[in-house]
Amino acid sequence: GPVPPSTALRELIEELVNITQNQKAPLCNGSMVWSINLTAGMYCAALESLINVSGCSAIEKTQRMLSGFCPHKVSAGQFSSLHVRDTKIEVAQFVKDLLLHLKKLFREGQFN
């Protein structure tokens, strides 16, 4: 059957931990992505930012997992109002910020 939302969120958190833990060289060669507002609709916004990073196998699983939280199809070059379009940050920092926010959502029981 379908994975419970709490399990899916926990697995996403653990995948982000693995990414931050296994950083030998700069994540995705130091690629920059648009920062996002960590609010409602955040999963789609995060996916929209990360999907523009190509050729980075380290975040492919994260991209797939985020797509499971986003109700619509996301493609490269697509941007929602949740992006802070004047701020770009490294993928590594993006992942760290997202991880901390997701841990707080998990604590609050916001699994969707």
Partner: antibody, heavy 122, light 108 residues
Framework: QMQLVESGGGVVQPGRSLTLSCAAS????????MHWVRQAPGKGLEWVGV????????HYADSVKGRFTITRDNSKNTLNLQMNSLRVEDTAVYYC???????????????WGQGTMVTVSS | SYILTQPPSVSVAPGQTATITCGGN??????VHWYQQKPGQAPVLVIY???DRPSRIPERFSGSNIGNTATLTISDVEEGDEADYYC???????????FGGGTKLTVL
């Protein structure tokens, strides 16, 4: 100001019972999860248990489960720890501490009492 | 149940930087809190949610949490920082709050 004050500590024989109380003041008690933490002489901190803001849930450390019971009275801003079948290894300073209540009780303890000493000895 | 491992002691000269670690399996997936406890006193929260600092705590205190290790860093250490430091997490699988064994910080 915001305060937690424990009381009820003392010397008790093994196998006997004792009830500790924690009086809260200066904040909205009913909106916080409340924990008990203990510290044996010269040892580290050990979590004892928690009761949710509305009293609907309690969780206990394995070392006290079945012997200790946490209750609260939100109308009187009080927290209680009923300790039964006390053992020598329960000897410790007992602290009450508050933590903002979410779906899960993973918040930090931002306010602690001064502690009350419980000595279990024959 | 979940286990947090801290070094029993850390020594540092005044003005230097103290680093206290807290190890746990995939601790990076958990929110970590840090407490300072001086002799005869109740613990005081110094870092919460991995890296946030209560308003009354000096900026010299900072925290991080990556992979299997959370870290409390105290820069420009002062004699008044000498204390025991404890890390803490909530273990979702057992519904238990867990403390590390504590680290005694000695200022030389």
């Amino acid at each position: 100001q915001m305060q937690l004050v424990e009381s009820g500590g003392g010397v008790v024989q093994p196998g006997r019972s004792l009830t500790l109380s924690c009086a809260a003041s200066g904040f909205e008690f009913r909106t916080y999860g409340m924990h008990w933490v203990r510290q044996a002489p010269g040892k580290g901190l050990e979590w004892v248990g928690v009761i949710w803001d509305d009293g609907s849930n309690t969780h206990y450390a394995d070392s006290v489960k079945g012997r200790f019971t946490i209750t609260r009275d939100n109308s009187k801003n009080t927290l209680n720890l009923q300790m039964n079948s006390l053992r020598v290894e329960d000897t410790a300073v007992y602290y009450c501490a508050r933590a903002p209540q979410w779906y899960l009780t993973a918040e930090a303890f931002d306010l602690w009492g001064q502690g009350t000493m419980v000595t279990v000895s024959s | 149940s979940y286990i947090l491992t801290q070094p029993p002691s850390v020594s540092v000269a005044p003005g230097q930087t103290a680093t206290i670690t807290c190890g746990g399996n995939l601790i990076g997936a958990k929110l970590v809190h840090w407490y300072q406890q001086k002799p005869g006193q109740a613990p005081v929260l110094v870092i919460y949610d991995d890296s946030d600092r209560p308003s009354r705590i000096p900026e010299r205190f900072s925290g991080s949490n990556i992979g299997n290790t959370a870290t409390l860093t105290i820069s420009d250490v002062e004699e008044g920082d000498e204390a025991d430091y404890y890390c803490q997490v909530w273990d979702y699988s057992s519904d238990h709050m867990v403390f590390g064994g504590g680290t005694k910080l000695t200022v030389l």
